[in-house]
Each structure stands twice: as C-alpha cells, then as structure tokens.
C-alpha cells in the first residue's frame, strides 16, 4: 500500500531518495542505505517455515507502482508499504501480515473418508 496519499501513477523525482535497507541492500548501497529514483519500502512476509521476515530497501521508479500495490498472492502471506516523503522514510513503516484465511490452516494432505 502507498503512504503519503500519493497518486497511483509514478512520477519522476527531481532528486535521489535515500532509503534504509535490510536483507535487500544492493551493491551500490553504503552503511545499509540505498539510493533510488522511486520509492523506499518495508515488507513483511513469511518464510518457508512460517516465520515473519521484515525486509526493507529501495524500489526503482520502473515497476514500483505495481510492486507497491500489495496485491494479494495466493498461498503467500505478505504485506508491503512504500513511501517517498523523506529520506529513510521506510524506517517508520510497519506493515503487518494479513490475517490467516481458513484455507491457510489446511497445510497437511487432504484426507478422504
């Protein structure tokens, strides 16, 4: 989801934006700070063992609108928030995992009578 009440169409920024990065730092980052022409993000998702993992970093302008839209993915619990209002704005983003749906509890084989 987008913060800041931004419009959905991404517009080119006149200046670089610095973001905190964690588990998602590109080679050109320095001291866990990355640079982008797009958005800062923070994302929470479950790993294979069901443990929530928080990732943060930079999204380039190209394709970031789609990535920040947080469309639900079947069988995957994750949530992403994006921001641009100031440098390292993603330090203050705290996305939460969407609630488990009933079908998500069925994780064993299907038993037939």
């Amino acid at each position: 989801k987008k913060e800041d009440g931004e419009s959905t169409a991404p517009t080119a920024r006149p200046k670089v934006l610095r973001c905190k990065c964690h588990h998602h730092c590109p080679e050109d980052s320095v001291n866990n700070i990355c640079s982008t022409d797009g958005y800062c993000f923070t994302m929470i998702e479950e790993d294979d063992s069901g443990t929530p993992v928080v990732t943060s970093g930079c999204l380039g302008l190209e394709g970031s609108d789609f990535q920040c839209r947080d469309t639900p993915i079947p069988h995957q619990r994750r949530s992403i928030e994006c921001c641009t209002e100031r440098n390292e704005c993603n330090k203050d983003l705290h996305p939460t995992l969407p609630p488990l749906k009933d079908r998500d509890f069925v994780d064993g084989p299907i038993h037939h009578k």
Epitope: P14, K15, V16, D28, S29, S35, T36, D37, C58, N87
Partner: antibody
Framework: QVQLQQPGAEVVRPGASLKLSCKAS????????MQWIKQRPGQGLEWIGE????????MYNQKFKGKATLTVDTSSSTAYMQLSSLTSEDSAVYFC?????????WGQGTTLTVSS | DVVMTQTPLSLPVSLGDQASISCRSS???????????LHWYLQKPGQSPNLLIY???NRFSGVPDRFSGSGSGTDFTLKISRVEAEDLGVYFC?????????FGSGTKLEIK
C-alpha cells in the same frame, strides 16, 4: 535561471573554524540536494558530502567526517558548510553544487586560504 | 572508493579536429535502478565546471551537438567532433552511482 552565489575568498588562521555559504536562487531550494566539492591545484575534485534541504538529511565522504558539517537555512535558500580545525591542507577552492541525480549547476567557488 | 581513470592527461589538438577522451571506472557504474550515473564536465580556467553530458550520453541543455558521450559498465568516452576555441579547458568525468561520488583527474584539451 539557476544561480548559486558564494563569497569569492576567505583567509583564516590555522586552527580556526569557518562557515562557508551558498545562496541558491532560480529554483525550489528543497527540490534538490546541495553538494560541496573541494578542488586543490593538482589534486583534482573531491566530493565532501551533500544535504537534502527538505529534511536536513546528510551524507558525507568518510574522509571529511569531523572536518565538514553541512546545514541549510530554507527560509533564505542558503546552504552552509562549517569547516573546523583548519590547516594548510584545507586551503582550496570549495564549490557548492545542485544535485538531483547528477550535478547540473555549480557555484563560482570560494577560495579558502589557511595561513598564519 | 570508485577510482575514475581518465586518459590522456593532456590532449593537444588542432581546431576543427576530432578529440576523444576516455574514462574508466574501477567498478561498474550501473546503478541498482538500471541507470548509469556517469557524467562529463568542462572547466575553463578560473571558472567552475559546466555540465556537458549526464548519464553517459545525454547532452545537457545548451550543449552543442558536437559533444557526444558513449560507453557502458566501466568504460566511457567523450567525443568532440570538431574542436572549437571555446572547447579548450579541462574535462572531468564523474560518477554518482557509488557513495562517495568521485571524479576523474581531468584531461586538458589544448591547442597543438
């Protein structure tokens, strides 16, 4: 048109501190970063650091941490660089420069002479 | 820090000649956004540098079309198709992909 005005020259004693200024006009001050760059004869150009006037966020070249401190006054669209504990090594021309994703406009530079 | 190596250090030319300046970086300048932040500046004696080319090959406003930039990754070139008297000075390449940003040592374009 974009203009970055800097004082032409400053002379200070070794050990002193000095605050250099850079007054911006012709654009929205908070829409671009302001960078500071050092040039010594025969030593080329060195990037000191940058400040985003919209939130006072700074990034420094490790080499100049403790030597340079960058600030801005958005009410007057002026950027400042404080240089401390000056030595002859700090004698140079100091440029301020507007930065978006690259430097597109430079100030005329302030020639700093550190001499007793 | 990324080292920017410019060659030659001095380039004597005759007016009307083509001039070519090379700039090599110690690391790739392709940013994680996909952009390549390599730029060229001209500094005339007693003046501040002026932007000529940004992001490898884009001419800045007001820059004559005799100036062109090319290259990718770590290897970049500035070409002046027909040198004019006003083109004389020191040319610098610069990268703003990696912090700290760095500059080449300069190429002095002078009359042969």
């Amino acid at each position: 048109q974009v203009q970055l005005q800097q004082p032409g020259a400053e002379v200070v004693r070794p050990g002193a501190s000095l605050k250099l200024s850079c007054k911006a006009s012709g654009y929205t001050f908070t829409s671009y970063w302001m960078q500071w760059i050092k040039q010594r004869p025969g030593q080329g150009l060195e990037w000191i650091g940058e400040i985003d006037p919209s939130d006072n966020y700074t990034m420094y070249n490790q080499k100049f941490k403790g030597k340079a401190t960058l600030t801005v006054d958005t009410s007057s669209s002026t950027a400042y660089m404080q240089l401390s504990s000056l030595t002859s090594e700090d004698s140079a021309v100091y440029f301020c420069a507007r930065f978006g994703f690259y430097v597109d406009y430079w100030g005329q530079g302030t020639t700093l002479t550190v001499s007793s | 820090d990324v080292v920017m190596t410019q060659t030659p250090l001095s380039l004597p030319v005759s007016l009307g000649d083509q001039a070519s300046i090379s700039c090599r970086s110690s690391q790739s300048l392709v940013h994680s956004t996909g952009n390549t932040y390599l730029h060229w500046y001209l500094q005339k004696p007693g003046q501040s540098p002026n932007l000529l080319i940004y992001k490898v090959s884009n001419r800045f406003s007001g820059v004559p079309d005799r100036f062109s930039g090319s290259g990718s990754g770590t290897d970049f070139t500035l070409k002046i198709s027909r040198v004019e008297a006003e083109d004389l000075g020191v040319y610098f390449c610069s990268q703003s992909t990696h912090v700290p940003f760095t500059f080449g040592s300069g190429t002095k374009l002078e009359i042969k």
